[in-house]
Interface confidence: medium
């Protein structure tokens, strides 16, 4: 067991080196270990191959580090990795696209406030168990088209406080089981009427606190299974243009916050769901 | 001033189920977590689980994995508490307790609710 | 059997010095902080210390933690009697992956 480190057995075979300054991954980890955990060091560097020779590592947490660089070989070997945690990394910003490949059992990746400005092409292929993926709190502007592709089983999709200017048509294409969705505090001012085609499973949609001024309901269409829907705090334009969102709100089954108008001037701060159709004129 | 305004007190019969429900004010209820925390008399707090709103999961105590589901209602900012199976030693109070959410795991608890005793008596 | 083990009882004089340990281990406070909480007759816990040594507003300065490898420590200096209460610690553990509590000190002004 390495110097700076508890080994123990039980209930898994676990490395536990936490908090204790470690400045690089420690050398010794026991290959039979399932459970890493070097959060709260000073790591600043994953090297390739970093755990090889713990072929039965089903948990690796190295949150709140200072991971500036990881290379693409560090997670190689890893085939019964189950969760990865490379969160509270500000330095970190960009992923080799190839870091998660082989990755094929992983199920919840945290990336979260990685200071992360893009994600690659390719960067989330294969990893088809994915079911939580923790993207919120960077500096993300972009979607790009087909990113989340090959994640059949995500549920879970954490997109809030980034700086996202659009959904693009194909930014969530193959999503098919997602059940949640959070985009809110970002930047988002236009939604492609059929960037949520592959959503038919998503509960719950968080879109608030962005510069939506409109969105069509033809995105929102195929939402079937949508319960619970936030559009708050966002530029709502309450014209003759809102009069889809707003049949398409008094027919929704499930709960939804306010949608509070910003224009024009008489209908500020009214919400758009109480408002009668004949409010919604000019254009 | 936050509150958690918890259901009211229950008896029920061994082998039934209980579910209790803890509704928070203001509207900042999806940012928190919400831990459900009990205290049988004469005995120490127990965590039986909780469930962070805006992530959509519940994560339970090793010892109420198999009997517990703990729900959250965003739309009415009510967390649920259901205990099945009931039997005579899990006659406790039971407390519903709002957290900061900090990172995925069950941070302190600094908003408590005034707890729900619940007895089981044949 | 509680996972953090605490002594059952405490007692002091009004103003004296109290300390309530904490003793735990490598998976839970050697790895995460420790919280303290008090239980005065008949209501809710209240949280006294968070992140091992932070107080939240409102609770005094005669309250105060610290934690120390896999042990934490809550020191309550210039005791009053308003302070009989139950006193718990509390942590996360990697483990058991769930939140721990000790067994609760009862604290006597005598």
């Known amino acids: 067991c390495p110097g700076a480190c508890v080994c123990y057995n039980e209930p898994k075979v676990t490395t536990s080196c936490p908090q204790q300054g470690l400045q690089a991954v420690p050398v010794g980890i026991p290959a039979a270990s399932q459970r890493i955990f070097l959060h709260g060091n000073r790591i600043s560097h994953v090297p390739a191959a970093s755990f090889r020779a713990c072929r039965n590592l089903t948990i690796l947490w190295l949150h709140s580090n200072v991971l500036a660089r990881i290379d693409a070989a560090a997670f190689t070997g890893l085939a019964l990795l189950e969760q990865l945690d490379l969160s509270d990394n500000a330095q970190l910003r960009s992923v080799d696209p190839a870091t998660f490949h082989g990755l094929g059992r992983l199920h919840t990746l945290h990336l979260d406030r990685c200071g992360l400005q893009e994600l690659g092409p390719g960067l989330f292929r294969g990893l088809a168990a994915l079911q939580y993926l923790y993207l919120q709190d960077n500096a993300l502007q972009a979607l790009p088209d087909d990113t989340f592709r090959d994640l059949g089983n995500l549920t879970h999709l954490f997109l809030h406080g980034n700086r996202i200017s659009s959904v693009p048509e194909r930014a969530f294409r193959g999503l098919h089981s997602l059940d949640r969705l959070l985009l809110h505090q970002n930047r988002v001012a236009h939604v492609h009427p059929h960037a949520f085609r592959d959503l038919g499973r998503l509960m719950t949609l968080y879109l608030f606190a962005n510069n939506l001024s409109a969105l069509p309901t033809e995105a929102l269409a195929p939402l079937r299974a949508l319960q619970y829907l936030r559009l708050n705090d966002n530029p709502w334009v309450c014209d003759c243009r809102a009069r889809p969102l707003w049949a398409w709100l008094q027919k929704f089954r499930g709960s939804s916050s306010e949608v509070p108008c910003s224009l024009p001037q008489r209908l500020a701060g009214r919400d758009l769901k109480r408002l009668a159709a004949n409010d919604l004129q000019g254009c | 001033e936050v509150q958690l305004v918890q259901s009211g007190a229950e008896v029920k019969k061994p082998g039934s189920s209980v579910k209790v429900s803890c509704k928070a004010s203001?509207?900042?209820?999806?940012?928190?977590?919400f831990s459900w925390v009990r205290q049988a008399p004469g005995q120490g707090l127990e965590w039986m689980g909780g469930?962070?709103?805006?992530?959509?999961?519940?994560k339970y105590a090793q010892k109420f994995q198999d009997r517990v589901t703990i729900t959250a209602d965003e739309s009415m900012s009510t967390v649920y508490m259901e205990l099945n199976s009931l039997r005579s030693d899990d006659t406790a109070v039971y407390y519903c307790?709002?957290?900061?959410?900090?990172?995925?795991?069950?941070?302190?608890?600094?908003?408590w609710g005034r707890g729900t005793m619940v007895t089981v008596s044949s | 059997q509680s996972v953090l083990t605490q002594p059952p009882s405490a007692s002091g004089t009004p103003g004296q010095r109290v300390t309530i340990s904490c003793s735990g281990s490598s998976s839970n406070i050697g790895s995460n902080t420790v919280n303290w909480y008090q239980r005065l007759p008949g209501a809710a816990p209240q949280l006294l210390i968070y992140?091992?040594?932070q107080r939240p507003s409102g609770i005094p300065d005669r309250f105060s933690g610290s934690r120390s490898g896999t042990s934490g420590s809550l020191v309550i200096s210039g005791l009053q009697s308003e302070d009989e209460a139950d006193y718990y610690c509390?942590?996360?553990?990697?483990?058991?992956?769930?939140?721990?509590f000790g067994g609760g000190t009862k604290l006597t002004v005598l």
């Open positions: 307790a709002r957290g900061p959410l900090v990172r995925y795991y069950f941070y302190y608890m600094d908003v």
């Open positions: 992140n091992n040594d």
């Open positions: 509390a942590s996360w553990d990697d483990s058991l992956n769930g939140r721990v």
């Open positions: 203001g509207d900042t209820f999806s940012s928190f977590g």
């Open positions: 469930i962070i709103p805006m992530y959509g999961t519940a």
